[in-house]
């Protein structure tokens, strides 16, 4: 009779995570008698999985009745599979004696666990990062067997190529981790964008699984500022507005601040969001430019999420030399001479006395037409102002004439001293009465920009104002 | 396909050390522990200890305590034997072995040998 | 445990049987190898678990024994099967290998 053959047809066998394995075990002979065990692995440290004879194995089941007479299947069962399960088991047939000694022994049926991977968790930098940089996200997802695993990177449905992605542990093990890091390029339009790593495996079954990250975590879009000034229908109010555009997160704080100090004059805001994400700011101030002797350098100074602020200055003149009227800078030089100051303000004497003789003109015709239409002409000294004398280098000499024209911005000039001359054109929108009104004032008012003090002295000043009222077919 | 490439010839000095390699391919290297085999010119094969590739853990056969020490560059799938104060009776053939089964806690037997590095120790 | 071949030498011919034996010092169960070794290289594993045949080892080379005597037998010995065989234990530490018995043409 041939002899006993311990036949293991199995050489490896793959189960899912919690489910059962069937360990295939058959005997050719019943004889020598003994019983069967089944062990993982080999050697010195192999583990007793089970004993036909004696012991407690909750797990392990037999597949056939072994306890039969002519039994010769010892295919056995282990329940609720976990990676740990991994490893090479063998069928062990014993003979009967005091004590059972090895016999013969199976060829060993490997045993490989299916786990499925956990979703996949992406995270980004921990700052945030302005667009044209690029940034590192990470994906991580583990407890995964085999170790064969595909990662891929998406950045909002466009596969992504540069990333870099390691498994572990880099030789056998009962499960296994990925760790994979994409770089991203970061635009303006990222707000809304989104970064997935997508995990598929054998366990998945075609279906894979995702993690996500929004770059409105990760991105930083610097806001850019434009100051600008309007003029507004009450006399001597300027509206300078300050539009911070295209920023993102919201996180903001706008200070004005006039001449370098932070202005305590309320300020109106809006907030808007654009389609990109991204929000804009509008905040104007509504400045008095009568309160004020001097230049007016006003600043719009923006800290936007926690970083440096940026700021644009915007100077508000009292002059007739033109300027531009948005700047960077923190301090300007003027530049003018006095020579050219004088050939302003002489041009401006003269436009004006020329204006004053026309309407006069214009006055003593209509009275004698005296043909219902009315003219009056007022000319009159205003108080005195109480004032330092010698403070006049601080005088502003200010004229306004309001034509009916189209929108012109005032010009303006910086001037070397503290002595300003300043001439604004202004107009407003034509009334909707046939009957227009031109208006011309001249106004000469010493104003002074100083800390105001006590005045000792008071110093006579004039002011002379002109009103013509013509009826405009 | 399978295989173990070890480090060419040694000719060192008596109180010399040598640190021999075993370059595995063709297998997850972490899954199979690694054994080292002496075998003295003309004589049979004796195991001096193993490493668990995995955990990098080593246990050293009693003969060979003290100046034998086993280990690992996981990332380059090499594992090395480095011997330390050289005596002419360290003059062998020294092999690296793998063990069969996968997650394996012990050695048994050695499907996968290396081709096998002498090291001559000699004044 | 101390593995002994007692046969250091084995004198044979092409086509013959020939059985090599190796006995342990104390019982090993079924947990024996066997190599064999040809001049200049690595070992090449012939059985396992006493009398399992490895991969790719020819039908002739079989293993039996358990406890602690057992035998290598190659049925049709072969020219190329001239070598030094080796058993091994893997029943507890240290492994231990046999002396070797060396197999040559009469």
């Known amino acids: 009779e041939e002899e006993l053959q311990v036949i293991q047809p199995d050489k490896s066998v793959s189960v899912a995570a919690g489910e059962s394995a069937i360990l295939h075990c058959t005997v050719t002979s019943l004889i020598p008698v003994g019983p069967i065990q089944w062990f993982r692995g080999a050697g010195p440290a192999r583990e007793l999985i089970y004993n036909q004879k004696e012991g407690h194995f909750p797990r392990v089941t037999t597949v056939s009745e072994s306890t039969k007479r002519e039994n010769m299947d010892f295919s056995i069962s282990i329940s609720n599979i976990t990676p740990a399960d991994a490893g090479t088991y063998y069928c062990v047939k014993f003979r009967k004696g005091s004590p059972d000694t090895e016999f013969k022994s199976g060829a060993g049926t490997e045993l490989s666990v299916r786990a499925k991977p956990s979703a996949p968790v992406v995270s980004g930098p921990a700052a945030r990062a302005t667009p044209q940089h690029t940034v590192s996200f990470t994906c991580e997802s583990h407890g995964f067997s085999p170790r064969d695993i595909t990662l891929k990177w998406f950045k909002n449905g466009n596969e992504l190529s540069d990333f870099q992605t390691n498994v572990d542990p880099v030789g056998e093990s009962v499960s296994y981790s990925i760790h994979s890091t994409a770089k991203v390029v970061l635009t303006r339009e990222d707000v809304h964008s989104q970064v997935i790593c997508e995990v598929a495996h054998v366990t998945l079954q075609g279906d894979p699984l995702r993690g996500t990250a929004n770059l409105s975590e990760t991105i930083r879009v610097p806001p850019t500022l434009e100051v600008t000034q309007q003029p507004v229908r009450a006399e001597n109010q300027v509206n300078v507005t300050c539009q911070v555009r295209k920023f993102y997160p919201q996180r903001l704080q706008l200070t004005w601040l006039e001449n370098g100090n932070v202005s305590r004059t309320e300020t109106a805001s809006t907030v808007t969001e654009n389609k990109d994400g991204t929000y804009n700011w509008m905040s104007w101030l509504l400045v008095n430019v009568s309160a004020h002797r001097d230049d007016v350098k006003l600043t719009c100074q923006v800290e936007h999420d926690g970083q440096p602020a940026v700021s644009k200055s915007h100077d508000l003149k009292v002059s007739a030399h033109p300027k531009e009227q948005g700047s960077n800078t923190a301090a300007e030089n003027t530049g003018s001479n006095e020579r050219n100051i004088y050939i302003v303000v002489g041009v401006v004497c003269t436009l004006l006395v020329a204006l004053l003789m026309a309407a006069l003109y214009l006055v003593r015709i209509r009275q004698k037409k005296a043909q219902g239409s009315t003219s009056s002409t007022r000319l009159h000294e205003p108080e005195k102002n109480a004032r330092e004398i010698t403070q006049d280098t601080n005088d502003i000499t200010y004229a306004d004439l309001n034509l009916p024209k189209g929108k012109k911005p005032a010009p303006q000039a910086a001037e070397p001293n503290n002595h300003t001359e300043y001439a604004s054109i202004q107009t407003s929108p034509q009334p909707a009465s046939e009957d227009t009104l031109t208006y011309a004032d001249l106004d000469m008012v010493h104003l002074n920009r100083t800390p105001k003090q006590p005045a000792p002295k008071p110093e006579p000043s004039f002011s002379e104002y002109a009103s013509v009222q013509v009826p405009r077919k | 396909q399978i295989q173990l490439v070890q480090s060419g010839p040694e000719l060192k000095k008596p109180g010399e050390t040598v640190k021999i390699s075993c370059r595995a391919s063709?297998?997850?290297?972490?899954?199979?522990?690694m054994s080292w085999v002496k075998q003295a010119p003309g004589k049979g094969l004796r195991w001096m200890g193993w490493?668990?590739?995995?955990?990098?853990?080593?246990t050293c056969a009693d003969d060979f305590k003290g100046r034998f020490a086993f280990s690992l560059e996981t990332s380059a799938t090499t594992a090395y034997l480095q011997i330390h104060n050289l005596t002419n009776e360290d003059t062998a053939t020294y092999f690296c072995?793998?063990?069969?089964?996968?997650?394996?806690?012990?050695?048994?037997?050695?499907?996968?040998w290396g081709q096998g590095t002498l090291v001559t120790v000699s004044a | 445990i101390v593995m002994t071949q007692s046969q250091k030498f084995m004198s044979t011919t092409i086509r013959d049987r020939v059985s090599i034996t190796c006995k342990a010092s104390?019982?090993?169960?079924?947990?024996v190898a066997w190599y064999q070794q040809k001049s200049g290289q690595s070992p090449k594993l012939l059985i396992y678990?006493?009398?399992n045949r490895y991969t790719g080892v020819p039908d002739r080379f079989t293993g039996s024994g358990s406890g602690t005597d057992f035998t290598l037998t190659i049925s049709n010995m072969q020219s190329e099967d001239l070598a030094d065989y080796f058993c091994?234990?893997?029943?507890?530490?240290?492994?231990?290998f046999g002396s070797g018995t060396k197999l040559a043409i009469k």
């Open positions: 072995a793998r063990d069969p089964h996968s997650y394996g806690n012990s050695p048994a037997w050695f499907p996968y």
């Open positions: 063709g297998y997850t290297f972490t899954t199979y522990g």
């Open positions: 490493i668990n590739t995995y955990s990098g853990v080593s």
């Open positions: 104390q019982n090993v169960g079924i947990s």
């Open positions: 678990s006493a009398s």
């Open positions: 091994q234990q893997y029943s507890s530490y240290p492994l231990t």
